[in-house]
Each structure stands twice: as C-alpha cells, then as structure tokens.
C-alpha cells in the first residue's frame, strides 16, 4: 500500500533481528497515539517485514546505537510511511500518529 500511513505495533516480537540485515529503525511513541513504545527495525531487504522491539531491551539499544553512528546507505523516506511489502504483524491502523522516523547521524568513524 504505497503512501499508506504506518500502523501501530501492538506487541513486541519474540525473535531478534541480526544487526547486519537491518537498514534503519524508527520509533513508535505512545505520546503520539500508539499504545506502547516500540522500535521498528527495517530490514535491508524491502520484501521482509519490519520487526517490532522493546526499546528497554539491551539488544535493541545496542542495535539502535550501532545504527545511530552508521551513515545511512540511502536517505530514508521522509515522514513515516509503510515500505512496500511491509508486514501486518500485530499492528492496528492509527493514521500517521505515533510514528517518528529516526534519522541516523552522519558522524565520522570513531566512538
């Protein structure tokens, strides 16, 4: 559904996504209309589903930090729109609320 608004993630995935297959992430924030805070990881393969994860988990924080310091291979779409082929894993329609794209900083290498 090209141009469709992103739905809310309702529950966290039990599986973890390997760091090297993730392209970027975006934050879902309850203050913007979704029921739970979440991090949605976008796989490099656009045909694969986003993965909804708990921002309090150690592995999620590690992956977010890694992505924050890595220059994005391509500029993410502006706004917060569903990628072609995104999954319907426990999400409900909420318009474009609750959806915040996190751009990755273009920092030079080094911690």
């Amino acid at each position: 559904s090209d141009g469709g608004a992103q739905d809310c993630c309702l529950k966290y995935s039990q599986r973890k996504i390997p760091a090297k297959v993730v392209r970027s992430y975006r934050k879902q924030e309850p203050s913007l209309g979704c029921s739970i805070p979440a991090i949605l990881f976008l796989p490099r393969k656009r045909s694969q589903a986003e993965l909804c994860a708990d921002p309090k988990e150690l592995w999620v924080q590690q992956l977010m930090q890694h992505l924050d310091k890595t220059p994005s291979p391509q500029k993410p779409a502006q706004g917060c729109r569903k990628d072609r082929g995104a999954s319907k894993t426990g999400k409900k329609g909420k318009g474009s609320k609750g959806c915040k794209r996190t751009e990755r900083s273009q920092t030079p290498k080094g911690p």
């Epitope: 309090k56 592995w59 930090q65 310091k69």
Partner: antibody, heavy 117, light 107 residues
Framework: EVQLLESGGGLVQPGGSLRLSCAAS????????MSWVRQAPGKGLEWVSA????????SYADSVKGRFTISRDNSKNTLYLQMNSLRAEDTAVYYC??????????WGQGTLVTVSS | SYELTQPLSVSVALGQTARITCGGD??????ASWYQQKPGQAPVLVIY???ERPSGIPERFSGSNSGNTATLTISRAQAGDEADYYC??????????FGGGTKLTVL
C-alpha cells in the same frame, strides 16, 4: 575526561560474597549500556555481565549465572556487581567497561578479587 | 556456547605485516571488535564494527570479517605494538564472547 573507577575488590573466602562498584564520570551514564569483564591471573579476558541503559535488561555469562547480579544506579552514576557463592575460579581482575553498539570503548583500570581460604 | 579461537602467539619482523585471526561459527554475520592489552594495563579498543578505527588508533591497524574468520592486520609493525590482542563479538542472546587472546611479538 571520561573515566571509570572500580572499587570493592579484596580477599574473600570460598562461598563468600563481595560487591564491586564502578563510578563513572565525564559522560552521560544513563545513555550507555555497561558491562563487567574479568581476567584471571595470566589468562584472557572473560565477559561476565551486561546491563541496559536504565537497568531493565540484564545478561550473564553461563559461568556466573545465578551467582552474580549486575545493577546500576543512574542517579549516582554507578555500576555494581553483587557476587555471591564465590569460588576459587572467580579470582580475577574485574573491569567495568562502557558499551556502545557492539563494542567496549572505555575501560576502567580494574579491581582485584581473590577467592581463597 | 559460542567460542572464538585465536592463535596463542604471532611473531612479526619489525616493519612487516602481522595478521591475527579470530575463528568462530559464522562470525562474519556478527560485528567483531579487537582490543589491545599491554602488561599491567586495561584493554584498549583498536578496531570495532569489523573494520572501523577509533580516533587515536593508527591507520596501520585494520580489520576484516567474513565467513568464519575475523582478522586484525597490523602493517609496518612497531616495537610498541607488542601486546596481547583479543577479538570479541556479541551473539543474539545478547551475550559477549572474547577470543582466548594472541600474544604479538615484534622481532
């Protein structure tokens, strides 16, 4: 200056307990995961435990699971390691290390724990 | 449990290139890091995310990681490079594993 300073090491008998502390300064403590890493005399590095930014999520090496507990007090910029049921093989220098993504970018100088009767 | 295997020791002639390997089941699918430790000192990060250098680490240090082997390469080896080197990697648990360490001798 970014700094980590461990304390609390010492001599303890087998079966005893000890609590290590790591005081952090020079950076925003609650923006980083933290880990404990140990090194037995003359041996290599062994990761012990890690904790997420706010302390919600914790992870342990199999060798210490059920005996050691990692925690943090972000208001005091301090990381802790509570060590119970200590064994001779727990004798080591214990380092605290700051985690960023998938690596440790800042290390303390270590504190020596000796388990002996 | 996951294991990383390093050679116990590697020797290199002054000014030549040293390569230290770190073997692990599909380590190329994870991010590897490398730490230098000199006697009586804490470890220091020299390579992270397979091949990135922290600020302050000479360009002579580089890394690669694919398949079952991560490699630390030190070109134009200097006497000051003599140290123990450890590879490290996180698995998905997440738990961290270090290799057994490699003693680098510069001849």
């Amino acid at each position: 200056e970014v700094q980590l300073l461990e304390s609390g090491g010492g001599l303890v008998q087998p079966g005893g307990s000890l609590r290590l502390s790591c005081a952090a300064s020079g950076f925003t403590f609650n923006s980083y995961s933290m880990s404990w890493v140990r090194q037995a005399p003359g041996k290599g590095l062994e990761w012990v435990s890690a904790i997420s930014m706010e302390g919600y999520s914790k992870s342990y090496a199999d060798s210490v699971k059920g005996r050691f507990t990692i925690s943090r007090d972000n208001s005091k910029n301090t990381l802790y390691l509570q060590m119970n049921s200590l064994r001779a093989e727990d004798t080591a220098v214990y380092y605290c290390a700051r985690g960023y993504g998938y690596y440790f970018d800042v290390w303390g100088q270590g504190t020596l724990v000796t388990v002996s009767s | 449990s996951y294991e990383l295997t390093q050679p116990l020791s590697v020797s290199v002639a002054l000014g030549q290139t040293a390569r230290i390997t770190c073997g692990g089941d599909s380590i190329g699918s994870q991010y590897a890091s490398w730490y230098q430790q000199k006697p009586g000192q804490a470890p220091v990060l020299v390579i992270y995310d397979d091949n990135e250098r922290p600020s302050g680490i000479p360009e002579r240090f580089s890394g690669s990681n694919s398949g079952n082997t991560a490699t630390l390469t030190i070109s134009r080896a200097q006497a000051g490079d003599e140290a123990d080197y450890y590879c490290g990697s996180w698995d998905s648990n997440p738990t961290h594993v270090f290799g057994g360490g490699t003693k680098l001798t510069v001849l």
